[in-house]
Amino acid sequence: IWELKKDVYVVELDWYPDAPGEMVVLTCDTPEEDGITWTLDQSSEVLGSGKTLTIQVKEFGDAGQYTCHKGGEVLSHSLLLLHKKEDGIWSTDILKDQKEPKNKTFLRCEAKNYSGRFTCWWLTTISTDLTFSVKSSRGSSDPQGVTCGAATLSAERVRGDNKEYEYSVECQEDSACPAAEESLPIEVMVDAVHKLKYENYTSSFFIRDIIKPDPPKNLQLKPLKNSRQVEVSWEYPDTWSTPHSYFSLTFCVQVQGKSKREKKDRVFTDKTSATVICRKNASISVRAQDRYYSSSWSEWASVPCS
Amino acid sequence: RAVPGGSSPAWTQCQQLSQKLCTLAWSAHPLVGHMDLREEGDEETTNDVPHIQCGDGCDPQGLRDNSQFCLQRIHQGLIFYEKLLGSDIFTGEPSLLPDSPVGQLHASLLGLSQLLQPEGHHWETQQIPSLSPSQPWQRLLLRFKILRSLQAFVAVAARVFAHGAATLSP
């Protein structure tokens, strides 16, 4: 058993049929010695008396809020949560496996630049009695500070018969050094509590590996005289690191119709303009990627050919 | 060329060669993103590698103030990786595929380090650690880790030279 926060404790249980469970001793936080009784949740049934209560925790019915009283007055609470371990593996029932970029990916994180700011998100089908707490650091043995905000519900989607909820959190490295080569990864730890179930999820990454620039901005077209060609120009996204002579992007420019199966024109460039062939009912799209490190491409920025 | 005395390097040449190094480092190990090598005790095996750190003056302001600190650090790293790529970690079993770009990568590391430090001038270089794994599978894992680390190192070097070529060239 360990303390998650004040008056909230996590009991780690090997979860299998007829498991013996864990013996837990609860102590009432009071100077009083006599006349103390214990109850669980809303029940008025007295579970025991005395300053300590010894219980055998085997299942979710044994978890919950234990309260010690004296003469009708509440003295203190202890909330017991269960963390299940099945076949040596901690349960991951609360969050959905996003399976990208690999199986058992519960947390996904992205950064728009090298400033040390990043966003992580996760998915669940659970709608109520759900809380998250996020901690982060740079490195684990001698951790350096990363500050995370509160996790918030950022999107709701309908997936077949189920509703899916996306939560996200923003974090900022306290002393970020955008130009340095990272040697220790960022660690992100998410505590998830659903009713009386506790789970924790972790992710470890370098900012450079989760970079995904915003799409290029201000796409403009200029038809070339006596030609089918069009000069397309754009600018670096506002959120990208500066100066651009140091933090450079490379771009992919594509002309394509509405269907992915249609023919296309495509060219890669390090410049912020390119000449392409525009077709009726097609769109010109541009996306960006770090020029020197192959992290994710941005989403496309598009303008119609006409 | 970046001479210890403090003259300027051939920024544009260094830019071109460092960008080539980036391309080669990714072709040598393109599936980097699909392997989470940090789970394999990454900190013990590659923490001896010279990283370009915050105080090394490789940020735009540091380069403007005095690029020599940064260039020395980059040179140190290039020599270090050049030695690693020539060591039995890469020459031993399992043999590299004949079309592996590691050979080109090795030659380009040497080429850039020579651009930075001509014959007869010597910056101190970092001692190469004795990473000599006994098992072929350990060697394979170490190769991946070294190439992954090299990708990060050459990316920073390429940014330095691109910025230098754009803003510090005579």
Partner: antibody
């Protein structure tokens, strides 16, 4: 499968014109760009231009501007390349090539030998 | 127009050996570079597109690398059917241009 079949060899006099055909099969004709590339005997490849069979748009290499006409007949899935004012240095194998991507060549015809000789 | 230069013009290699072919552009072309193989009396065949992207059906011994102005086609272990002429082609800007070719012959 995607296939391009070209017309047979031609012998022409200097100053004459030649029209080479390229019949496509195995795909929807308007779904691919069509290019013409030539190769003089013992020489390398030279791009001449492209046509979009969907709308008839064309773009030629400056070298052939005014001397080449590229057309298509969607009813027969056939592309044509006419080269006028032939000179002896136009002697070459003329290839049609196609791709969904505009700027490189995925599928090639077998080539048509055009000899220009007086 | 962009001039593409291939070297060497002829490469003599023994079967089973590795062949490295070079292609240089007269200006930076990012990764807008494609490789073709041509055997005598046949049309060219696309091997690699956008500098390093492999084509399904092309043996894995063919690989491409490079960006900017310098590109390489590597044939890891030459088979008898690989003796041919290889061309690079830039697609950075029109007119599209080819290199002069590298003939890979049996040593």
């Amino acid at each position: 499968q995607v296939q391009l079949v070209q017309s047979g060899a031609e012998v022409k006099k200097p100053g004459a014109s030649v029209k080479v055909s390229c019949k496509a099969s195995g795909y929807t004709f308007t779904d691919y760009y069509l290019h013409w590339v030539r190769q003089a005997p013992g020489q390398g490849l030279e791009w001449m231009g492209w046509i979009d069979p969907e709308n008839g748009d064309t773009e030629h290499a400056p070298k052939f501007q005014g001397r080449v006409t590229m057309t298509t007949d969607t009813s027969t899935s056939t592309a044509y390349m006419e080269l006028r004012s032939l000179r002896s240095d136009d002697t070459a194998v003329y290839y049609c090539a196609a791709n969904k991507e505009l700027r490189y060549f995925d599928v090639w015809g077998q080539g048509t030998m055009v000899t220009v000789s007086s | 127009e962009i001039v593409m230069t291939q070297s060497p013009a002829t490469l003599s290699v023994s079967p089973g050996e590795r062949a490295t072919l070079s292609c240089r552009a007269s200006q930076s072309i990012s990764i807008n570079l494609h490789w073709y193989q041509q055997k005598p009396g046949q049309a060219p065949r696309l091997l690699i597109y956008f500098a390093s992207q492999s084509i399904s059906g092309i043996p894995a011994r063919f690989s491409g690398s490079g960006s900017g102005t310098e590109f390489t086609l590597t044939i890891s272990s030459l088979q008898s059917e690989d003796f041919a002429v290889y061309y690079c082609q830039q697609s950075n800007s029109f007119p599209l241009t080819f290199g002069g070719g590298t003939k890979v012959e049996i040593k």
